[in-house]
Interface confidence: low
C-alpha cells in the first residue's frame, strides 16, 4: 500500500524525505525561515500528513506563505517610511521610524530601523518589538536668539518664536468679590508641563498659609507674542497645580511650581520646551549672561502702588526680553542685608542684574525663565525663575532681581512629571 510521491511546497520541505512511503508513514511539512504553513487559510508552523491504508495521503500538501508583519504601529509625534519598494511589510522588509523634527527627537538616538522578523513582528536591534519614543526637543528656538544684546525694564521687543517656551499664566478667581485676577509667566518643559514660581500660583490670602489656586482658575497661553492678539496662541486649562511643598511665603524660599496642562500642546516654531539643567548645587556661575522674557512692566517709572491699583493694564503688549548677568551670591546677599526689611537670599536662589540698574525683571514677569545658553549641548537651559526683588522700583541701582535656582529642584521636577531623570538629562550634559 504505497502512497504517491510527495513534492515539497515552494519555500518548504517535507521530513523525512524518502523515495517511497507506505501505510502508516507520517511526514511533517514545514516552511523556510520567514514563511508559514498555510492550510485552509489557517497559518501554522508545521503540518502533519499520513499515508493511509488505501494508498492515499490523509491531506493535500499545504502551501508556504511569506510572513507578513502587517502595518507597523503608529508612533506618537513620529513618521514611518518604508525602505522596501511598494511599501512591503513581509519578511525582511524594512521600515524607518523618525520623529517630527525639529520639534521632537528620538530617545537614545535610536536608528528607528525595524525589520520584519520571521515571527511576523517588527523588530529593532536595540528596542526589540517596542516602539521608539519621540521626546520634545528642548532649548532650540526656531529663530536663533541674538548672541549680543546691548547692555521687562530696559528690555526690548522679542520677535515671535524667540522664546518658544514662554507661557503667560492668567489666574482668575471668580469666587471672590471683587474678582481676583493676576498673571505671571512660566516656561514649557514638555508638551504637558509648565514650570513657574510658586508665588504665582499661591492662593492670595492674608495669612501665610500656602494653598495653591484652584486649577479651574488657571489659564495658560503658549505661542503668545502680543497680548492684544491671542488668536495665534494655544490656550490650555490646568489639570494639576503643584507647588513645592516647602515654599515659604515669608522669604520666598523654594519658589517653584508646576502646572500640568489639561491636554498636551502641539509643538511648533512658536511652542517648544526649554531644557532643564542638570542637578547642580552651584547653579549658574557668577557673571554668566542669561535672558529673561516677560510681559511685565517695562516702564521704569511705574511705582509699585500704580501697578497694584491698575491691575493687568500695566502688561507690556509685546513680549519683552532683557539680558542680565548672574551676580555673585555674596554680593547679592550683602546688597539685601544692607537694606531695612527681612530679606533672605538663600542657597535656593541666585541674583542677576546690573549694579547701576536700568535693566531688570519686574512685577508680572514672575515665574518666567532665566535662560542660559549651554555651549556644549547648544541649547537654552532654564537656570532661574523670576522670584522677587527689593522694595525700590524695578531696575533701581544695586537692586538685583532674585531668581529661584532651578538646578536645586531638577529631581523634584522630574518626580512630579513622572519621568525618569535619565530620559532627558543627557541633552544638557556638560
Amino acid at each position: 500500500n504505497e502512497c504517491p510521491e510527495l513534492q515539497p511546497p515552494v519555500h518548504g520541505k517535507i521530513e523525512p524525505s524518502q523515495a517511497k512511503y507506505f501505510f502508516k508513514d507520517q511526514v511533517l511539512v514545514s516552511c523556510d525561515t520567514g514563511y508559514k504553513v498555510l492550510k485552509d487559510n489557517v497559518e501554522m508552523d508545521t503540518f502533519q500528513i499520513e499515508c493511509l491504508k488505501d494508498g492515499t495521503w490523509s491531506n493535500k500538501i499545504p502551501t508556504c506563505k511569506i510572513v507578513d508583519c502587517r502595518a507597523p504601529g503608529e508612533l506618537e509625534h513620529g513618521l514611518i517610511t518604508f525602505s522596501t519598494r511598494n511599501n512591503l511589510t513581509t519578511y525582511k522588509s524594512e521600515i524607518k521610524y523618525s520623529c517630527q523634527e525639529p520639534y521632537y527627537k528620538m530617545l537614545n538616538n535610536n536608528t528607528g530601523i525595524y525589520t520584519c522578523s520571521a515571527q511576523g513582528v517588527w523588530m529593532n536591534k536595540v528596542l526589540g518589538r517596542s516602539l521608539p519614543t519621540c521626546l520634545p526637543e528642548c532649548g532650540q528656538p526656531s529663530r536663533s536668539l541674538p548672541s549680543l544684546v546691548k547692555r521687562i525694564i530696559g528690555g526690548r521687543n522679542a520677535e515671535p518664536g524667540l522664546f518658544p517656551w514662554q507661557a503667560l499664566i492668567v489666574v482668575e478667581d471668580t469666587s471672590r468679590v471683587p474678582n481676583d485676577k493676576w498673571f505671571g509667566s512660566g516656561a514649557l518643559l514638555s508638551a504637558s508641563w509648565i514650570l513657574t514660581a510658586a508665588h504665582v500660583l499661591r492662593s492670595q490670602r492674608r495669612d501665610t498659609t500656602v494653598i495653591p489656586v484652584s486649577k479651574e482658575h488657571v489659564t495658560v497661553y503658549l505661542g503668545l507674542h502680543d497680548v492684544r492678539d491671542k488668536s495665534g496662541a494655544v490656550n490650555s486649562s490646568a489639570a494639576r497645580v503643584v507647588l513645592h511643598p516647602d515654599f515659604n511665603i515669608q522669604n520666598y524660599n523654594h519658589d517653584i511650581a508646576l502646572v500640568q496642562l489639561q491636554e498636551p500642546v502641539p509643538l511648533g516654531p512658536h511652542v517648544m520646551p526649554v531644557c532643564l539643567p542638570r542637578l547642580e548645587p552651584e547653579g549658574p556661575a557668577p557673571h554668566m549672561l542669561g535672558l529673561v522674557a516677560g510681559w511685565g512692566i517695562s516702564n521704569p517709572n511705574v511705582t509699585v502702588d500704580e501697578i497694584i491699583s491698575s491691575g493687568t493694564r500695566t502688561l507690556s503688549d509685546v513680549l519683552q526680553y532683557v539680558k542680565l548677568p548672574v551676580v555673585p551670591h555674596a554680593e547679592c546677599k550683602t546688597s539685601y542685608e544692607s537694606r531695612s526689611g527681612n530679606y533672605s537670599v538663600t542657597e535656593n536662589m541666585f541674583c542677576a542684574g546690573y549694579y547701576e540698574g536700568g535693566k531688570d525683571t519686574c512685577l508680572g514677569d514672575s515665574g518666567g525663565a532665566f535662560v542660559i545658553f549651554d555651549d556644549l549641548s547648544q541649547r537654552w537651559v532654564v537656570q532661574g525663575l523670576v522670584s522677587w526683588g527689593g522694595p525700590e522700583e524695578c531696575g533701581s541701582k544695586q537692586v538685583y532681581g532674585v531668581y529661584t535656582k532651578v538646578s536645586n529642584y531638577v529631581d523634584w521636577v522630574w518626580e512630579q512629571m513622572g519621568l525618569p531623570q535619565s530620559v532627558v538629562e543627557p541633552q544638557v550634559e556638560r
Epitope: 516647602d246 515669608q250 542637578l279 529642584y409
Partner: antibody, heavy 120, light 109 residues
Framework: QVQLKQSGAELVTPGASVKMSCKAS????????IEWMKQNHGKSLEWIGN????????KYNEKFKGKATLTVEKSSNTVYLELSRLTSDDSAVYFC?????????????WGHGTLVTVSS | DIVMTQSQKFMSTSVGDRVNVTCKAS??????VAWYQQKPGQSPKALIY???YRYSGVPDRFTGSGSGTDFTLTISNVQSEDLAEYFC???????????FGAGTKLELK
C-alpha cells in the same frame, strides 16, 4: 540603589583621634552632600555637618567645629569623619546619611552607623 | 538653635490602636519637619517630610500634620512592627544646625 557603607566599630583612648568612613554607591557621588549625625547611647540625634563632593564645601554645626573634620576621597566615593581630642562624651554611634532631594534637608538614606567607644 | 521638644519619652499602645506622637518647635519652622522611625541597633528610617508628605514605601497608616510650631505623627491601626522610637527633625534653620527631637518610644501596654 543608593547605599552608604560605614566602617567598623572603633575602640579608642581619650585624647586620641578617630577617622571613620562612609562609602557611597548607587548614584552620582558629586550630586549630593553626605551628612553626619551623632547618636549617644539611648539618646537623640545631633547633626554634625555635611560635606559636598561637588565642590568640597563643608558645613558644620557650631557645636562640632574643632571637634569634627570632614574630608573626601573622590576616587572611591568615600567621605571621612575625623574626630579629634576624644573624650567619653564622644562615645556614640555616628551615622552618615544622604538627602533624597537636594533641596530638602531631611535624610532618606542612612549608613548602618559606626560605634565609637572612648575608654582608657 | 531651634529646640524640638517631644514631651512624651514613652507611649504605651496596643496593636490596632491609633496613636499621636507630638513634637513642638521652639520657634516657627513652617512645614520644614521630618519624622523618623528607629528600631534598636538600626539606623533611622524616614517616614514623613515637609510635615505631611509620606516618604515612598511608607505605609499609609503613618500620617503627619502641623505647621509653625506644633507637629503630630499619627499612626492609625498600630502594628507590632511599629513598636520603635520616633524622632522629629526640623530643617528650617539649615545651614545652621538641623535639630532633632529627643525621641518618643512606642511600647506595648
Amino acid at each position: 540603589q543608593v547605599q552608604l557603607k560605614q566602617s567598623g566599630a572603633e575602640l579608642v583612648t581619650p585624647g586620641a583621634s578617630v577617622k571613620m568612613s562612609c562609602k557611597a554607591s548607587g548614584y552620582t557621588f558629586t550630586t549630593y552632600p553626605i551628612e553626619w549625625m551623632k547618636q549617644n547611647h539611648g539618646k537623640s540625634l545631633e547633626w554634625i555637618g555635611n560635606f559636598h563632593p561637588y565642590n568640597d564645601d563643608t558645613k558644620y554645626n557650631e557645636k562640632f567645629k574643632g571637634k569634627a573634620t570632614l574630608t573626601v576621597e573622590k576616587s572611591s566615593n568615600t567621605v571621612y569623619l575625623e574626630l579629634s581630642r576624644l573624650t567619653s562624651d564622644d562615645s556614640a554611634v555616628y551615622f552618615c546619611a544622604r538627602r533624597v532631594y537636594y533641596s530638602y534637608f531631611w535624610f532618606g538614606y542612612w549608613g548602618h552607623g559606626t560605634l565609637v567607644t572612648v575608654s582608657s | 538653635d531651634i529646640v524640638m521638644t517631644q514631651s512624651q519619652k514613652f507611649m504605651s499602645t496596643s496593636v490596632g490602636d491609633r496613636v499621636n506622637v507630638t513634637c513642638k518647635a521652639s520657634q516657627n519652622v513652617g512645614t520644614h519637619v521630618a519624622w523618623y522611625q528607629q528600631k534598636p541597633g538600626q539606623s533611622p528610617k524616614a517616614l514623613i517630610y515637609s510635615a505631611s508628605y509620606r516618604y515612598s514605601g511608607v505605609p499609609d497608616r503613618f500620617t503627619g500634620s502641623g505647621s509653625g510650631t506644633d507637629f503630630t505623627l499619627t499612626i492609625s491601626n498600630v502594628q507590632s512592627e511599629d513598636l520603635a522610637e520616633y524622632f522629629c527633625q526640623q530643617y528650617n534653620s539649615y545651614p545652621r544646625a538641623l535639630t532633632f527631637g529627643a525621641g518618643t518610644k512606642l511600647e506595648l501596654k
